[in-house]
Interface confidence: medium
Amino acid sequence: YNVFPRTLKWSKMNLTYRIVNYTPDMTHSEVEKAFKKAFKVWSDVTPLNFTRLHDGIADIMISFGIKEHGDFYPFDGPSGLLAHAFPPGPNYGGDAHFDDDETWTSSSKGYNLFLVAAHEFGHSLGLDHSKDPGALMFPIYTYTGKSHFMLPDDDVQGIQSLYGPGDEDPNPKHPKTPDKCDPSLSLDAITSLRGETMIFKDRFFWRLHPQQVDAELFLTKSFWPELPNRIDAAYEHPSHDLIFIFRGRKFWALNGYDILEGYPKKISELGLPKEVKKISAAVHFEDTGKTLLFSGNQVWRYDDTNHIMDKDYPRLIEEDFPGIGDKVDAVYEKNGYIYFFNGPIQFEYSIWSNRIVRVMPANSILWC
């Protein structure tokens, strides 16, 4: 997190806000609900209280405007700048302005007013942008999904550094951004994508360029807004320029940033029995056109060329790949070796000699 220079903050805990005007995109009650919910994000974790005024001067004046709207910080038409807010202080201090050239919504379409407002009110209270891609105060808008919003830990630490904690946090679970060098780090899925490596963990993935040590961290939804926050397994089919992503009983085919029509499909359409609830890991072999799909202590082999499950499967993981354990969290193949991830450990398995050749920490893939 980051606070503004000179640690700008309000010197009182009871703050007022006023909605000066409304966007035509939403009903008045939807707008009011979005702003109330956005203030609650911050009051839930601090001693701050927010009261709405219907007229007069409030600490935080909220308005919608376009282009030059009276503060010498003009908006720029659709997309680009969405909104801005002033840090705590008199006059403009704390005020939040929203660009009415955007389409404001209470859903994933256009820009979600609650999410943008919660971010802007962070500025109104004294938080600057964060470098943590998981933080609400990260400067890039990402719709985080329909489920109940949880304020990330980085933002909680930031706002409590200014105002301290509240009496009781109604939602004490604040998602932390994974630390790639945490020795207990386990991974959810790994796939190549157009020469890069994508390493998935929780609602994030690390993007590793070849010959590069520093992996970039992204929210999965910043790449693929339609995907679930978390995924179970992934593999690339390079000759078709596709990657396949699995979550629960569904899977998606993606070409770059775009989901193919007809997806998601059910994993049962691949020939998996109905009792398989999820795929835990998947890896594709371009030379044979086969894909291994792991679930529980079993492995299936799918023929991507003929679109059928191979006979004699499922088989036990321990029988086909002795020594790697009875589950696989994530897997990928490179230069004749399969890398199996099981908890905080990865096994380098030689396809040629059919045995484990190295055991390493899972996060050594991230150069830790």
């Epitope: 659709p78 997309s79 890039i140 808008y141 990402t142 992204f218 910043s222 790449f223 320029d241 070409n255 770059g256 940033y257 775009d258 193919l260 029509e261």
Partner: nanobody, 114 residues
Framework: EVQLVESGGGSVQPGGSLRLSCAAS????????MNWYRQAPGKQREFVAG???????NYAVSVRGRFTISRDNSEGTGYLQMNSLRPEDTAVYYC????????WGLGTLVTVSS
């Protein structure tokens, strides 16, 4: 419906630069990812670079560090700045919006030779 028209192709010597443009008609361009693909004579069409709606970029390994993709939603235009061109970059370059099942331009020829 989005129509795409590429321009900016031509002949250039190795080490030279070109800037390809992709003009989109239709106001929905900003709702789609924008990609460049290329096809060399006798070869399969291959991905070159992509930029998401949220302006996240992605490059083929062979062009990373030399090519830069960008977009201007207000103008409805996408760009591919190609520097340090090599003979193996010779191909017809196609603009795409929305991925393999999306919209395609007719292509513009880039020739790199001495």
């Amino acid at each position: 419906e989005v129509q795409l028209v590429e321009s900016g192709g031509g002949s250039v010597q190795p080490g030279g630069s070109l800037r390809l443009s992709c003009a989109a008609s239709g106001s929905t361009f900003s709702r789609y990812s924008m990609n460049w693909y290329r096809q060399a004579p006798g070869k399969q069409r291959e991905f070159v670079a992509g930029i998401s709606v949220g302006r996240i970029t992605n490059y083929a390994v062979s062009v990373r560090g030399r090519f830069t993709i960008s977009r201007d939603n207000s103008e409805g235009t996408g760009y591919l700045q190609m520097n340090s061109l090599r003979p193996e970059d010779t191909a017809v370059y196609y603009c795409n919006a929305g991925g393999l099942q999306g919209y395609w331009g007719l292509g513009t020829l880039v020739t790199v030779s001495s």
